[in-house]
């Protein structure tokens, strides 16, 4: 079981720990120069008790 691809964030690049996003995988978003990150920069894929695996947070935004 794995998390869905959390997607790209405009004005950022991302570092992924594993291409298929299994439980324990992380995605780190790094905003482009001049942009400020709003939200969590690192998401982790977690198992849930009833539902399918889910990211620890929503993807962030990179704002001017």
């Amino acid at each position: 079981t794995s998390c869905h691809d959390p997607g790209d964030v405009e004005h950022s690049r991302r570092l992924i720990s594993s291409p298929k996003f299994p439980v324990g995988a992380t995605v780190q978003y790094i905003c482009d120069q001049g942009f400020v990150l709003m939200g969590s920069s690192i998401l982790t894929c977690h198992d849930r008790q009833a539902g399918s695996p889910k990211w620890s947070d929503r993807a962030p935004k990179c704002l001017l």
């Epitope: 977690h46 539902g51 399918s52």
Partner: antibody, heavy 116, light 112 residues
Framework: QVQLVQSGAEVKKPGASVKVSCKAS????????MHWVRQAPGQGLEWMGG????????VYNQKFKGRVTLTEDTSTSTAYMELRSLRSEDTAVYYC?????????WGQGTTVTVSS | DIVMTQSPDSLAVSLGERATINCKSS????????????LAWYQQKPGQPPKLLIY???TRESGVPDRFSGSGSGTDFTLTISSLQAEDVAVYYC????????FGQGTKLEIK
């Protein structure tokens, strides 16, 4: 704002059933699991079970298995907890609470009194 | 089932002093894949539902005053209130979500 609003207090006789509702607003209902926790008078918190509104998958505390059923209606963003074969020890405040790994939003609680 | 045991059962602390509540789990709450401890702390005041204070053992929930902090890993966890305020009088619960959900028995915090 994110809110969980529960149905009103209930008084039931031993052996009867009760169904408590929990209406969610302010967020996408299917994005989070919904769990039920009860608290007997003067006692601590006891987890009863949870449901994933997206898949309808449920998990239950073994203590309540066979006596409790969790359901939901995504069209109205409402979760339900039905407890059957009520006994006096089921007298408690019943809470619905949103969360996947921790419970960040709670309903106001529904008092269920079981008395003959 | 994972059993959560809090200590002490009750605690009286002077205003402005530090309050420390401990929570011990019967098995480790550290997930080796996610590297997180599945442990949260809740505050409950009379007549109110519980309120989330801390999750992942040490992450403060948005809006919670920074006098509240959580620490620990594996089986031993601590909630610390660095400088007790009158509004902190409540019952505090730890809860685990490593395997289903269970709560500690609660710690009643009062003012000395």
């Amino acid at each position: 704002q994110v809110q969980l609003v529960q149905s009103g207090a209930e008084v039931k006789k031993p052996g009867a059933s009760v169904k408590v509702s929990c209406k969610a607003s302010g967020y996408t209902f299917t994005d989070y699991e919904m769990h039920w926790v009860r608290q007997a008078p003067g006692q601590g918190l006891e987890w009863m079970g949870g449901i994933d509104p997206e898949s309808d998958n449920t998990v239950y505390n073994q203590k309540f298995k066979g006596r409790v059923t969790l359901t939901e209606d995504t069209s109205t963003s409402t979760a339900y907890m039905e407890l059957r074969s009520l006994r006096s020890e089921d007298t408690a405040v019943y809470y619905c609470t949103r969360g996947d790994w921790y419970f960040d939003v709670w309903g106001q609680g529904t008092t269920v009194t079981v008395s003959s | 089932d994972i059993v959560m045991t809090q200590s002490p059962d009750s605690l009286a602390v002077s205003l402005g002093e530090r309050a420390t509540i401990n929570c011990k789990s019967s098995q480790s709450l550290l997930n080796s894949r996610t590297r997180e401890n599945y442990l949260a702390w809740y505050q409950q005041k009379p007549g109110q539902p519980p309120k989330l204070l801390i999750y992942w053992a040490s992450t403060r929930e948005s809006g919670v005053p920074d006098r509240f902090s959580g620490s620990g890993s594996g089986t031993d966890f601590t909630l610390t209130i660095s400088s007790l305020q009158a509004e902190d009088v409540a019952v505090y619960y730890c809860g685990q979500s490593y395997n289903l959900f269970t709560f500690g028995q609660g710690t009643k915090l009062e003012i000395k």
